[in-house]
């Protein structure tokens, strides 16, 4: 049995999420569970720091992209949303909230604005943006 989850505000098209093929969860109520990750889209616009705080308050973090295979549903995300990728001026690296460094070839980085934070957009693209610019955001929780 497959559950057709269609979130018009988040995805470009209908996203099929398996319910019985393998157990996924637990996730907070109304979050999407997919391949051992919980995701939620928040459509209120906040700057990066406020978005991070919002995710943390729900025991989650901003979206971390770590695998094109495990996170293939992200291909279909529409518009732009804050993710947990930031530039660290002290060492010049781009890293995730957990301190891990951005893996090469995982995201196509577009230097859209002069900033130190990044927005996620469809097809594994990251758009550099000023951290103080308000945007919608995606929170993520690992289930394992």
């Amino acid at each position: 049995i497959w559950s057709a989850v269609f979130l018009n505000s988040l995805f470009n098209q209908e996203v099929q999420i398996p319910l019985t093929e393998s157990y996924c969860g637990p996730c907070p109520k109304n979050w999407i569970c997919y391949k051992n990750n919980c995701y939620q889209f928040f459509d209120e616009s906040k700057n990066w720091y406020e978005s991070q705080a919002s995710c943390m308050s729900q025991n989650a973090s901003l979206l971390k992209v770590y695998s094109k295979e495990d996170q293939d549903l992200l291909k279909l995300v529409k518009s732009y949303h804050w993710m947990g990728l930031v530039h660290i001026p002290t060492n010049g690296s781009w890293q995730w909230e957990d301190g891990s460094i951005l893996s090469p070839n995982l995201l196509t980085i577009i230097e859209m604005q002069k900033g130190d934070c990044a927005l996620y957009a469809s097809s594994f693209k990251g758009y550099i943006e000023n951290c103080s610019t308000p945007n919608t955001y995606i929170c993520m929780q690992r289930t394992v």
Epitope: G92, W94, I109, I110, E111, Q113, D116
Partner: antibody, heavy 122, light 112 residues
């Protein structure tokens, strides 16, 4: 190899118009800010302006804002500089350049075009 | 606009000499993000300019370590520890902190 190939330069009469082009190879221009800089004979480099990847932000040198229009066509991987009401002092070698803004640690011009010469004369 | 003043405009050297070029900005070029976007470019005869130094003191990839940048606020310096023939050309300082961005007038490094 990353290259920015420029064209469109030449002789133009005072008061006339000209459009310079910059075509990229080995690089996807749609990911980067691009700039134009010129060097007049016997003078130094002068920054004209810059444009961001989706053309939502374009910055010009105020003294040149009414003379130049910077645009881009990401589908064709090209950058353009429209010149209008040219005068003799616009005679120069014009460069298109990629400017990196890869986080606040990395702001710089790293790939320069071949340059194209514009001569304003009657 | 930020005026970038380079000195000297001409610098005659012998190969192996140390060379020093000064660049002064008419106001602070510390960006609101705390960084100072002072860059140095070299234009050799018949070539497009090339990046040497960014953010005051960072050498760009492939630039020999005989090139070094220093300074802060409004006073900046480019030093070449031992000049080689391939170093001859016109050096420009550039500020990318405040729009409109501006170049110095250039310093011509030439043989005595």
């Amino acid at each position: 190899e990353v290259k920015l190939l420029q064209s469109g330069g030449g002789l133009v009469q005072p008061g006339g118009s000209l459009k310079l082009s910059c075509a990229a190879s080995g690089i996807d221009l749609s990911r980067y800010w691009m700039s134009w800089v010129r060097r007049a004979p016997g003078k130094g480099l002068e920054w004209i302006g810059e444009i961001n990847p989706d053309s939502s932000t374009i910055n010009y040198a105020p003294s040149l804002k009414d003379k130049f229009i910077i645009s881009r066509d990401n589908a064709k991987n090209t950058l353009s500089l429209q010149m209008r009401k040219v005068r003799s002092e616009d005679t120069a070698l014009y460069f298109c350049i990629r400017r990196r803004y890869y986080g606040s640690s990395y702001w710089y011009f790293d790939v320069w075009g071949t340059g194209t010469t514009v001569t304003v004369s009657s | 606009d930020v005026l970038m003043t380079q000195t000297p405009l001409s610098l005659p050297v012998s190969l192996g000499d140390q060379a020093s070029i000064s660049c002064r900005s008419s106001q602070s070029i510390v960006h609101t993000n705390g960084n100072t976007y002072l860059e140095w470019y070299l234009q050799k005869p018949g070539q497009s300019p090339k990046l040497l130094i960014y953010r005051v003191f960072n050498r760009f990839s492939g630039v020999p370590d005989r090139f070094s940048g220093s300074g802060s606020g409004t006073e900046f310096t480019l030093k070449i520890s031992r000049v080689e023939a391939e170093d001859l050309g016109v050096y420009y300082c550039f500020q990318g902190s405040h729009v409109p961005f501006t170049f110095g007038a250039g310093t011509k490094l030439e043989l005595k």
